[in-house]
């Protein structure tokens, strides 16, 4: 059982969150495309979290393919320290509240929130399920608490921590899992599998995050939720690695699997897209 | 006070296009999501397509999708609807909302008659 | 998509007197942020439409407090507490809920 081969590492609290993305087409695997010509391109790595060269072919491929390392790393990366802990007392919005409201390209049309830059506020919006950008919040609340300026002089991030503004402290936020865990993974780990609505039977993975195990179920096919993986490996992968157990005292202990070597293969269900 | 005034209707033979405007004013249009909607004469309403703030999203009826494209240039306060592969079913009176932060349609157009006859 | 359905489709009053419109949705209205989001516009002779209430119950600026909306889950009802000749044209039930928004066929409100 691959959920043996896991290694317990202390961590400490700077450690990147999960990779969230501004661009989806950022997670995509870098496509050479099926032509033959050898032209030097960038792309962004989501394992390695940088843009990286590789050989385009010339056609076709993908939106994961820049002409010079500086527009992917303008595309696909931001300022971590800037992006993650706000250390001004201005604590500027994250940069992806400024983003449109963005759909996406599937239609399973349910209601989202997004920060309207031009009214300065949380809005409704109909998110079609998949992609998409991270100005995408499950709440009003939620959308508030991270792209509105807050009454009381904090802002809050979108890692689950808020910005204390008189001494810039992070102060973890309460979590809907078990007391001794915070989840840090993809939101969609937290959700219970949805066969969808269509007819197949097709066998996939979901995380169960009671038992915090990767488990079997049925797949209609369509529809359905983000946590729906096609194989065990890639469930841990997804999910596992998101929950941090809490010492007591104050240290991490992080359960995070080992790096084996890694098949770059993005599904819909490894891009982290904020809240999809 | 908000207005939205459409134009561009007119008499279409089937399979011909047209391309509607609303001018929209009392407002700040860049702030609100925008929709077309129809009525058929005698008929009910219909939703036809509605743009997000900005203009790069879009979401369409089934029964226009592929023949309609929803547009806007929020420098010049308009919204656009440009109908191509037109139909006798698309004879209408079109109008354009706006949309709410609730994502509702609030203020509506006076509406221009769209006919699709040979 | 969500079917609208209205009744009744004419409805004849008389000046002064209460009118009531029904409208149910073929599923639940309730979305899952909570809100219900039901909506009711007038259409005047001759005029474009003109939002009344939204959200089930709440009365856009302007609108008269004669009319008042109410309802949950599938059943939703639009009454007009005293019927006034203004109050003439065809009034439309439409849902924001589930995506795409759909209308009901539209109740035609005369003074007999």
């Known amino acids: 059982d691959s959920e043996e081969d896991e290694e317990h590492t202390i961590i400490t609290d700077t450690e990147l969150p999960p990779l969230k993305l501004m661009h989806s087409f950022c997670a995509f695997k870098a496509d050479d495309g099926p032509c033959k010509a050898i032209m030097k391109r960038f792309f962004f790595n989501i394992f390695t979290r940088q843009c990286e060269e590789f050989i385009y072919g010339g056609c076709e491929g993908n939106q994961n393919r820049f002409e010079s390392l500086e527009e992917c790393k303008k595309m696909c990366t931001r300022d971590n320290a800037n992006r993650i802990i706000k250390t001004t007392l201005q604590q500027e919005k994250p940069d992806f509240c400024f983003l449109e409201e963005d759909p996406g390209i599937c239609r399973g049309y349910i209601t989202r929130y997004f920060y309207n830059n031009q009214t300065k506020q949380c809005e409704r919006f109909k998110y079609g399920g998949c992609l998409g950008n991270m100005n995408n919040f499950e709440t009003l609340e939620e959308c508030k608490n991270i792209c509105e300026d807050g009454p009381n002089g904090f802002q809050v991030d979108n890692y689950g921590t808020q910005l204390n503004a008189v001494n810039n402290s992070l102060t973890p936020q309460s979590t809907k899992v078990p007391s001794l865990f915070e989840f840090h993974g993809p939101s969609w780990c937290l959700t219970p599998a949805d066969r969808g609505l269509c007819r197949a039977n097709e066998n996939r993975f979901y995380y169960n995050s009671v038992i915090g195990k990767c488990r079997p179920f049925k797949y209609s096919g369509c529809g359905g939720n983000e946590n729906n993986f096609t194989s065990k490996q890639e469930c841990l992968r997804a999910c596992k690695k998101g929950f941090i157990q809490r010492i007591s005292k104050g240290g991490l202990i992080k359960t995070k699997r080992k790096r084996k070597k890694q098949r770059v293969k993005i599904a819909y269900e490894e891009i982290f897209v904020k809240n999809m | 006070e908000v207005q939205l005034v459409e134009s561009g209707g007119g008499l279409v033979k089937p399979g011909g296009s047209l391309r509607l405007s609303c001018a929209a004013s009392?407002?700040?249009?860049?702030?609100?999501?925008m929709n077309w909607v129809r009525q058929a004469p005698g008929k009910g309403l219909e939703w036809v397509s509605t743009i997000t703030t900005g203009g790069s999203y879009t979401y369409y009826a089934d029964s226009v999708d592929g023949r309609f494209t929803i547009s806007r240039d929020n420098a010049k306060n308009s919204l656009y609807l440009q109908m191509n592969s037109l139909r006798a079913e698309d004879t209408a009176v079109y109008y354009c909302a706006r949309q709410d932060g609730h994502f509702l349609m609030d203020y509506w157009g006076q509406g221009t008659l769209v006919t699709v006859s040979s | 998509d969500v079917v609208m359905t209205q009744t009744p489709l004419s409805l004849p009053v008389t000046l002064g007197q209460p009118a009531s419109i029904s409208c149910k949705s073929s599923q639940s209205l309730l979305d899952i942020d909570g809100k219900t989001y039901l909506n009711w516009l007038q259409q005047r002779p001759g005029q474009s439409p003109k939002r009344l209430i939204y959200l089930v119950s709440k009365l856009d600026s302007g609108v008269p407090d004669r009319f008042t909306g109410s309802g949950s889950g599938t059943d939703f009802t639009l009454k007009i507490s005293r019927v006034e000749a203004e109050d003439v044209g065809v009034y439309y039930c439409w849902q924001g809920t589930h995506f795409p928004f759909t209308f009901g066929q539209g109740t035609k409100v005369e003074i007999k």
């Open positions: 009392g407002f700040t249009f860049s702030s609100y999501a």
